[in-house]
Amino acid sequence: AITEAREEAKPYPLFPGPLPGSLQTDHTSLLSLPHTSGYQPALMFSPTQPGRPYTGNVAIPRVTSAGSKLLPPLAFKHTVGHIILSEHKDVKFNCSISVPNIYQDTTISWWKDGKELLGAHHAITQFYPDDEVTAIIASFSITSVQRSDNGSYICKMKINNEEIVSDPIYIEVQGLPHFTKQPESMNVTRNTAFNLTCQAVGPPEPVNIFWVQNSSRVNEQPEKSPSVLTVPGLTEMAVFSCEAHNDKGLTVSKGVQINIKAIPSPPTEVSIHNSTAHSILISWVPGFDGYSPFRNCSVQVKEVDPLSNGSVMIFNTSASPHMYQIKQLQALANYSIGVSCMNEIGWSAVSPWILASTTEGAPSVAPLNVTVFLNESRDNVDIRWMKPLTKRQAGELVGYRISHVWQSAGISKELLEEVGQNNSRAQISVQVHNATCTVRIAAVTKGGVGPFSDPVKIFIPAHGWVDHAPSSTPAPGNADPVLII
């Protein structure tokens, strides 16, 4: 018969007691060896009544040298099959076998769940020789058992290339429930149902789950693990946890915060990084995202001018980086700028508005009526023009830029001259004779250089030719004139 040792089953109906044929104890196994040397009676490890026929691996010894009698089959004696104990307790269990003295070099190895236990395990084998047989007792001890020690332990012994295997000893380490799945923090849409999952395992089983929301139990009665809680929707942040109960007690999961997605807070600290005549580079610090990632942002620009129609220009941009170059602005203008960002719920309010100005622009028109003629006596070219009609936004005229290109026999050379804003004429030295000089003039303000006038060409003859007439800016639609003297 199988050795049985067990506690009386508890009357509580929710958690079953130990299985038949098991030992449930919070102490070292009753069928264990004390840590002492010397003779240990074999009956501690085997039933006193005759063993049942063994169905495992046995070694059948051959006939003795005298040929007179057969030895009985070798088998491990039966011991307790199931030990149940609490985590952190110590346990010791063993197997025993009587081996005829004709066999030499018998070794016993311990195996757990099909793998040999080697190294730092507390396994002790003791031999008790007698006239004809040697009783061998292999004991295995574990201090402060953990769940990882759960499993099926067996002894193996090799004799004459035969392998003898013991019955398994199943170790069941019981403890508080252990979470394999806990609820996770989430960001959820207001009034929208969502699920939380909680799973815990023993042993002992069953493990029962209670859900807790903001310190109140959601389910009045336990639910079997695993449990999925469908939260019917929230209007404000809530904290959830789950309690896992088993026969040994209770384990509480981490508390997780469930946040309600909302529109973002408005951006702050809108700053101007750079202004040009027609663009402004801004940056901002994003507000709180409302528990939902930013999707994009909107830069709103209003012209601050009593004469403007008050319309708002809107520029959409990605949420990151938190920078945007506002383009297509008027020069020398004042603007009010605000930023708003959106997530899946909606748009934030607009940031505090800031004032920004564009700088002076470059002139938008070229000087008018450009005329060019050769002053041969001085060996220079006279250039005259009329001041362009610039807009206020172009700023104050600071001068003119004259471009003159000299082309002769495949050689081309461009020169640039700067003249003051009070001038409307200039002289340039002749660079090359027997060449064409092409002149263009642009107005200059602090905002930059305006467009160049249409080119005016004049031919510079070899020395001794007479200056007859000027070249001038052509009327629109006409070809560039070339005056040859």
């Epitope: 959601v218 389910n219 009045e220 009665q221 639910e223 809680l229």
Partner: antibody, heavy 118, light 106 residues
Framework: QVQLVQSGSELKKPGASVKVSCKAS????????VHWVRQAPGQGLEWMGW????????TYAQGFTGRFVFSLDTSVSTAYLQISSLKAEDTAVYYC???????????WGQGTLVTVSS | EIVLTQSPATLSLSPGERATLSCRAS?????MHWYQQKPGQAPRPLIY???NLASGIPARFSGSGSGTSYTLTISSLEPEDFAVYYC?????????FGGGTKVEIK
């Protein structure tokens, strides 16, 4: 389908006792608690407490301790409400209801009228 | 104990009209359930957890609210909707009901 069937009306004298039964069917009885609710004539609903069908543990609301006892017989999926030392003010309809998550009473018995009169 | 106050006590309306029933809690609650009761009948679940319709309840019923203020709305009253309505809180023990609002035919 889920059903809660309560015992019939009772007429009792002051000082007597009464036991109202609530038989559940159509679901696993021990998975849900049983709540008890009182409604005096022409009055609103008053929560009396509930019985944990898993552990057998009762919970009583204030004002319903002492003379009121919730009990269970899980073998027949039945919850009981016993009121002892009946008074005239105990005259009411008593309802049992199944308690779901968030203490939501999703199925109700038809009610049992208990009249206490001399 | 959380006290639930329902208002108005009586609401006199005609079929087709919109009914708005209020339930105020003496302190913040997480969810409010609503039940309908007709004379001689047991209460019938209507709204679960503030805004979820119970099984078989028509879409003209809706619930909303948070914190201490909750509302049951019947968008267009049908003849069968004239009854007493109770709110019940889930947050803390004891579970409490409101005093009820009677919706009667004008």
């Amino acid at each position: 389908q889920v059903q809660l069937v309560q015992s019939g009306s009772e007429l009792k004298k002051p000082g007597a006792s009464v036991k109202v039964s609530c038989k559940a069917s159509g679901y696993t009885f021990t998975n849900y608690g049983v709540h008890w609710v009182r409604q005096a004539p022409g009055q609103g609903l008053e929560w009396m407490g509930w019985g944990n069908t898993y552990t057998g543990e009762p919970t009583y609301a204030q004002g319903f301790t002492g003379r009121f006892v919730f009990s269970l017989d899980t073998s027949v999926s039945t919850a009981y409400l016993q009121i002892s030392s009946l008074k005239a003010e105990d005259t009411a309809v008593y309802y049992c209801a199944r308690g779901n998550r968030y203490a939501y009473m999703d199925y109700w018995g038809q009610g049992t009228l208990v009249t206490v009169s001399s | 104990e959380i006290v639930l106050t329902q208002s108005p006590a009586t609401l006199s309306l005609s079929p087709g009209e919109r009914a708005t029933l209020s339930c105020r809690a003496s302190s913040s609650v997480s969810y409010m359930h609503w039940y309908q009761q007709k004379p001689g009948q047991a209460p019938r679940p209507l709204i679960y957890a503030t805004s979820n319709l119970a099984s078989g309840i028509p879409a003209r019923f809706s619930g909303s609210g948070s914190g201490t203020s909750y509302t049951l709305t019947i968008s267009s009253l049908e003849p069968e909707d004239f009854a007493v309505y109770y709110c019940q809180q889930w947050s803390s023990n004891p579970r409490t009901f409101g005093g009820g609002t009677k919706v009667e035919i004008k």
